[in-house]
């Protein structure tokens, strides 16, 4: 591994702090905050150039002061180089309790995977300790203040700082971002890069050509007066170490959306159609709303077009208030801030048959006492084609007497216009209503016809219905 050739190397190859015998061999230990020093030797004087300890205690005032020796302070090196530095301290043998040296960076203890070694050089006066720290291939994250700490006689001693400044190519903290813009409308792009080293200068590039002849200091805001077509912008960040280029971003011109596609009918009822579609390309501007256009397909003339507006999402709309059993042509168009898309291809859709719109007419009710049945008759209602094919009738009959209430209904087929139902309760009132049924559903009920059912044979007959137009009772 090649190490950066700086004055730092003297910290390893140069003379050690304090007086050590020439033939003295050090012993080493990997860094741990729990390293124990060897037994202290005889006393000696303290070296002159030391960093003042950060903490003092009453007990320690009885002993000569001990502090880390001065070392390199501000290390400047390039990214990916190797660096090594150290802390050293001389502990006289008068100090009985000492713990190992720990390394700290920006206020946090460095534990684990850092390459540090502590070397001990004992002699007759005490022990010299050197804590070596090395970083291979430094990165920006290695920038910061490094300190050594150790406890001597329960007093924490902190070294002077070693500030590691890793210099490299500019590093982007804000790159231009893709934006969609209105044609010929001004917009801004921002680019910010940092060192060290500083300053960082910015050049803007549009479609591979430089925009500004003179660089701007980071951060830089480029105001583009307007574009008529899509362009690609990037920024170059320069410092003394070289150049970094940002990502290229596409600036798109907003246009009207493409027409929706895949218009489908999901469900039809007699009076509504549920339609879905796939939005077309949004034209680089969010779709705001959509318009469903509906026209009757059967009309020979250009019938009026019904327009239903809805939000752009979900891509679904229920068209309501349509005629039953009718054919319609349907298309969809959507808009963004620029304008409306062309309409989608028209598709055909049909509503199903509806329920009858008119109740049966001329309802009469008779009591057949001998058979104990009600005889009910009516006239078939005038059913339109879109109401569908008549399939039968529903007869509702409600029986009421003192303390009793019974609500019943029967369905009868469309053959004929009469029905018989058994008497349920005597000495009661029976209310009869009839509705026509088609495949489209059940129509409205007729006006009620009441009949009083006597205890034995007295009958009060009360027909109550509107005669069909043009018909007379016989």
């Amino acid at each position: 591994e090649k190490w950066e050739e700086t004055e730092l190397d003297q910290l390893f190859s140069g003379p050690l702090p304090g007086r050590l015998p020439v033939n003295h061999r050090p012993f080493s230990a990997p860094h741990s905050s729990r390293d124990q020093l060897p037994p202290p030797q005889t006393g000696r004087s303290h070296p002159a150039h030391t960093a003042a300890p950060q903490v003092t205690s009453t007990a320690s005032k009885l002993l000569p002061p001990v502090a880390f020796n001065h070392t390199i302070g501000h290390i400047v090196l390039s990214e990916h180089k190797n660096v090594k530095f150290n802390c050293s301290i001389n502990i006289p043998n008068t100090y009985q309790e000492t713990a190992g040296i720990s390394w700290w960076k920006d206020g946090k203890e460095l534990l684990g995977a850092h390459h540090s070694i502590t070397q001990f050089y004992p002699d007759e006066e005490g022990v010299s300790i050197i804590a070596l720290f090395s970083i291979a291939s430094v990165q920006r994250s290695d920038n910061g203040s490094y300190f050594c700490k150790m406890k001597v006689n329960n007093r924490e001693i902190v070294s002077d700082p070693i500030y590691v400044e890793v210099q490299g190519l500019p590093y982007f903290i804000k790159q231009p971002e893709s934006v969609n813009v209105t044609r010929n409308t001004a917009f801004n792009l921002t680019c910010q890069a940092v060192g060290p080293p500083e300053p960082v200068n910015i050049f803007w590039v549009q479609n591979s050509s430089r925009v500004n002849e003179k660089p701007e200091r980071s951060p830089s805001v480029l105001t583009v007066p307007g574009l008529t077509e899509t362009a690609v912008f990037s920024c170059e960040a320069h410092n003394d170490k070289g150049l970094t280029v940002s990502k290229g971003v596409h600036i798109n011109i907003k246009v009207i959306p493409s027409p929706p596609t895949e218009v489908h009918i999901l469900n039809s009822t007699a009076h509504s159609i549920l339609v879905s579609w796939v939005p077309g390309f949004d034209g680089y501007s969010p779709l705001q709303n959509c318009s469903i256009q509906v026209k009757e397909a059967d009309r020979l003339s250009n019938g009026s077009v019904m327009v239903f507006n809805t939000s752009a999402s979900p891509h679904l709309y229920e068209i309501q208030q349509l005629q039953a059993l009718a054919n319609y042509s349907i298309a969809v168009s959507c808009r963004n801030e620029i304008g409306w898309s062309a309409v989608s291809p028209w598709i055909l859709a049909s509503t199903t048959e509806g329920a009858p719109s008119v109740a049966p007419l001329n309802i009469t009710v008779f009591l057949n006492e001998s058979n104990n049945i009600l005889d009910i008759r009516w006239t078939k209602p005038p059913i339109k084609r879109q109401d569908g094919e008549l399939v039968g009738y529903r007869i509702s009959h409600v029986w009421e007497s003192a303390g009793t209430y019974k609500e019943l209904s029967e369905e009868v087929s469309q053959n004929g216009s009469w029905a018989q139902i058994p008497v349920q309760i005597h000495n009661a009132t029976c209310t009869v209503r009839i509705a026509a049924i088609t495949k489209g559903g059940i129509g409205p009920f007729s006006e009620p016809v009441n009949i009083i059912i006597p205890e034995h044979s007295k009958v009060d007959y009360a027909p109550s219905s509107t005669p069909a137009p043009g018909n007379t009772d016989s």
């Epitope: 001065h70 501000h74 203040s145 500030y163 500083e198």
Partner: antibody, heavy 122, light 111 residues
Framework: QSLEESGGRLVTPGTPLTLTCTVS????????LGWVRQAPGKGLEYIGI??????TYYATWAKGRFTISKTSSTTVDLKITGPTTEDTATYFC??????????????????WGPGTLVTISL | DIVMTQTPASVEAAVGGTVTIKCQAS??????LAWYQQKPGQPPKVLIY???HLASGVPSRFKGSGSGTQFTLTISDLECADAATYYC?????????????FGGGTEVVVR
């Protein structure tokens, strides 16, 4: 990146005065900002600094006489609590050289404002 | 506090010549030292940091050296544009405080 001082004016002794440093393109949560003054025809005099974390440090002579505070994401104030004629000077704000989310560090000054003149006179 | 003593207070030299400015710290500041250039009516501009590292855009005619308590700024091949006042600054710090201080300044006159 730029800095600009404002608030410099003529005041009488004892009248508190607040100067404001407004930054552009500088993230005050990443950089320290310091104040330095220069009396007419004299040298530069360090007053104090506010770190990226908001910790303040003052020169010994300036403690109690000046207060530095971050008032927004783009402004830092220097309050001269009880000015005397000796405080007549051009006051500069300057950005610390290194970005870092720590309370202390090597604070030499990389970018300076043009300065604002404060005159303390009767 | 750390006190920075700068000498000389003023120095004169001819175009093409060399000037040397010295700065002494009252205690060891390792290499936490910066040099600034200031011209009349302008704010200072950093020339050198970490005692010997040239700031961006500064010509290599400016050279810083020293460590501990003794520092030197040397300007060689003097140009008229170098006429200015030069200041040293300690930016030493500890784990609990910072010790910023400027020297008194040296005026460089280029004739």
């Amino acid at each position: 990146q730029s800095l600009e001082e404002s608030g410099g004016r003529l005041v009488t002794p004892g009248t508190p005065l607040t100067l404001t440093c407004t930054v552009s393109g500088i993230d005050l949560s990443s950089y320290a900002l310091g104040w330095v003054r220069q009396a007419p025809g004299k040298g530069l005099e360090y007053i104090g600094i506010i770190s990226s974390t908001g910790t303040t440090y003052y020169a010994t002579w300036a403690k109690g006489r000046f207060t530095i505070s971050k008032t927004s994401s783009t402004t830092v104030d220097l309050k001269i609590t009880g000015p005397t004629t000796e405080d007549t000077a051009t006051y500069f704000c300057a950005r610390g050289a290194y970005a870092g989310y720590v309370a202390f560090g090597p604070y030499y000054f990389h970018i300076w404002g043009p300065g604002t003149l404060v005159t303390i006179s009767l | 506090d750390i006190v920075m003593t700068q000498t000389p207070a003023s120095v004169e030299a001819a175009v093409g010549g060399t000037v040397t400015i010295k700065c002494q710290a009252s205690q060891s500041i390792s290499n936490f030292l910066a040099w600034y250039q200031q011209k009349p009516g302008q704010p200072p501009k950093v020339l050198i940091y970490a005692a010997s590292h040239l700031a961006s855009g500064v010509p290599s005619r400016f050279k810083g050296s020293g460590s501990g308590t003794q520092f030197t700024l040397t300007i060689s091949d003097l140009e008229c544009a170098d006429a200015a006042t030069y200041y040293c600054q300690s930016y030493f710090y500890s784990s609990t405080s910072i010790y910023n201080a400027f020297g008194g300044g040296t005026e460089v006159v280029v004739r």
